[in-house]
């Protein structure tokens, strides 16, 4: 969280002067109430933007808009303080438009934007707009806050952002997986122009259940030049077990510039559309455990096989 | 593979507390808040609250304010939701569901029930 | 707190046709919205976020069309696992608050 790094930052329009400057998210008039205090915004509106650093990298940000009420409480009104709150990490982020001029009726109804908060893929904010002066202990509040969840890399919009393409959002495997006779997968994936390698993690499960009946992990070693961009196929051999018949495979691929947390995707075959009455399902030990990463799986090859070869 | 794990079904008195835990696996618990849902039996979803477990900052529903606790304990990445003077209309299945705003992952739900 | 309603409390309709939920805000909730799909026995899973980005694993079936106070998630073609009660759920403002759920059963 932080804040667009080579924009001056104006919020003077016709008929007010104001400035913008970097707040400590406590304003002066918490300390000092003063008797008259303006209103809350009228509406928020929050959106999601793209916009480029000095380095020319292209960055997820906050695009912020807000109205005044039309009442005569314009009179009073100082600035306004945006607030950003990453709510995992409690993170916050303001920033104080300064009113240098006293804001007048006019024929149209105030509007303010500010686009300048960068955010991150996948995380959830809440965004604040607090007009100044705040209220006296106990008057009415005069702040107005939204909840915005930025979408992740798989997102159309994201994707090409630099965050997301480190992590290699640009990458599109197009999975494709086939049930084969005798208890067997045929996966096929596009490989990435990197020579890297590559994990398949199979998670199986029976028909409407979400614990696994059966995990599995195979390795796939770094392609060679000139096997990028070509199909990987893979075979992997099932637990023979009844009922064991929804399957999800998830390739996760290991770039350098993101090494273990790369995106990874994923594609699901469903059980026959009429399933055998399902045996009961012996209790099952996994065959990796969970660790405190999100790559945490260990191999086991001796409970299920695969093998794997490049097709040109 | 993300997983959340809920403890088992609990029977209570009126006036007792209850606490559910809620182990995660497949990902670092810090990365995302924890919230609860709960579900009366035949009915709708009501958001409780959530808390991260990065920070330990929490937001309960104003139903919920001065009868709900939720914590985190990182070590065992687990996450804990505790519920005082029950009534018997706490009477309901317990989630808990990762994230704060459009929960993707759930627990297997905790049924309590509340009965004198 | 902002009222979702949904209807309608229950819809009937023959597999591989197409089903029409609809979801009602109090007030505008821009894009945030998501919906779920809850099985007899199981917890909700989440289907769409943003009221139209897909979760990660749903069908290209299942869409959401809506912004503001009407939302709208179509199911194109009904398999036999969509049999299910659908929530939707805002996280505009605080609290979240959920949909009363339409049950989607086979006619």
């Known amino acids: 969280l932080r804040l667009l790094d080579h924009r001056a930052l104006v919020c003077s329009q016709p008929g007010l002067n104001c400035t913008v400057k970097n707040s400590t998210c406590l304003d002066d008039s918490w300390i000092h109430p003063r008797n008259l205090t303006p209103s809350s915004p009228k509406n928020i509106y929050i959106n999601l933007s793209v916009s480029s650093t000095q380095h020319g990298e292209l960055v997820p940000v906050l695009h912020v808009e807000w109205t005044l009420q039309t009442d005569a409480s314009i009179l009073y009104l100082e600035g306004a303080e945006l607030s950003v709150l990453q709510l995992n990490t409690n993170e916050r982020l303001c920033v104080r438009f300064e009113f240098l001029s006293k804001l007048r009726h006019h024929h149209r109804r105030w509007r303010f934007t500010f686009s300048h908060f960068v955010v991150d893929p996948d995380q959830e904010y809440e965004v604040t707009v607090h007009h100044l002066p705040k209220p006296i202990p106990d008057g009415d509040p005069n702040h107005q806050s939204k909840n915005f969840l930025v979408p992740d890399c798989e997102h159309a919009r994201m994707k090409v952002t630099t965050p997301c393409m480190s992590s290699g959002s640009l990458w599109d495997p197009n999975i494709t997986v086939e049930t084969l006779e005798a208890h067997q997968l045929r996966v096929s994936f596009t490989l990435w122009n990197e020579s890297t390698h590559y994990q398949i993690l199979l998670t199986s499960f029976p028909h409407m259940e979400n614990h696994s009946c059966f995990e599995h992990m195979h390795h796939i070693p770094a392609p060679r030049p000139e096997e990028f961009h070509q199909r990987s196929n893979v075979t992997l051999t099932l637990r023979n077990l009844k009922g064991c018949c929804r399957h999800q495979v998830q390739i996760q691929p290991f770039f350098s510039s993101c090494l273990n947390d790369c995106l990874r995707h994923s594609a699901t075959v469903s059980c026959p559309e009429m399933p055998d009455t399902p045996e009961p399902i012996p209790d099952y030990m996994p065959l990796w455990e969970p660790r405190s990463g999100s790559s945490d799986y260990k191999d086991d090859d001796d409970k299920g096989s695969s093998h794997h070869h490049h097709h040109h | 593979q993300v997983q959340l794990v809920q403890s088992g079904a609990e029977v209570k008195k009126p006036g007792a507390s209850v606490k559910v835990s809620c182990k995660a696996s497949?990902?670092?618990?810090?990365?995302?808040?924890i919230s609860w849902v709960r579900q009366a039996p035949g009915q709708g979803l009501e958001w409780m609250g959530w808390i991260s477990a990065y920070s330990g900052n929490t937001k309960y529903a104003q139903k919920f304010q001065g009868r709900v606790t939720m914590t985190t304990d990182t070590s065992t990445s687990t996450a804990y939701m505790e519920l005082r003077s029950l009534r018997s209309d706490d009477t309901a299945v317990y989630y808990c569901?990762?994230?704060?705003?459009?929960?993707?992952?759930w627990g297997q739900g905790t049924l309590v029930t509340v009965s004198s | 707190e902002i009222v979702m309603t949904q209807s309608p409390a229950t819809l009937s309709v023959s597999p591989g046709e197409r089903a029409t939920l609809s979801c009602r805000a109090s007030?505008?909730?821009?894009?945030?919205l998501a919906w779920y799909q809850q099985k007899p026995g199981q917890a909700p899973r989440l289907l769409i976020y943003?009221?139209?980005t897909r979760a990660t694993g749903i069908p290209a079936r299942f869409s959401d069309n809506g912004s503001g106070t009407e939302f709208t998630l179509t199911i194109s073609s009904l398999q036999s696992e969509d049999f299910a009660v659908y929530f939707c759920?805002?996280?505009?403002?605080?609290?979240?608050?959920f949909g009363g759920g339409t049950k989607v059963e086979i006619k």
């Open positions: 007030q505008s909730i821009s894009s945030n």
């Open positions: 943003g009221a139209s």
């Open positions: 497949g990902y670092t618990l810090t990365s995302y808040g």
């Open positions: 569901a990762r994230r704060q705003l459009a929960l993707d992952y």
């Open positions: 759920q805002q996280y505009d403002t605080w609290p979240l608050t």
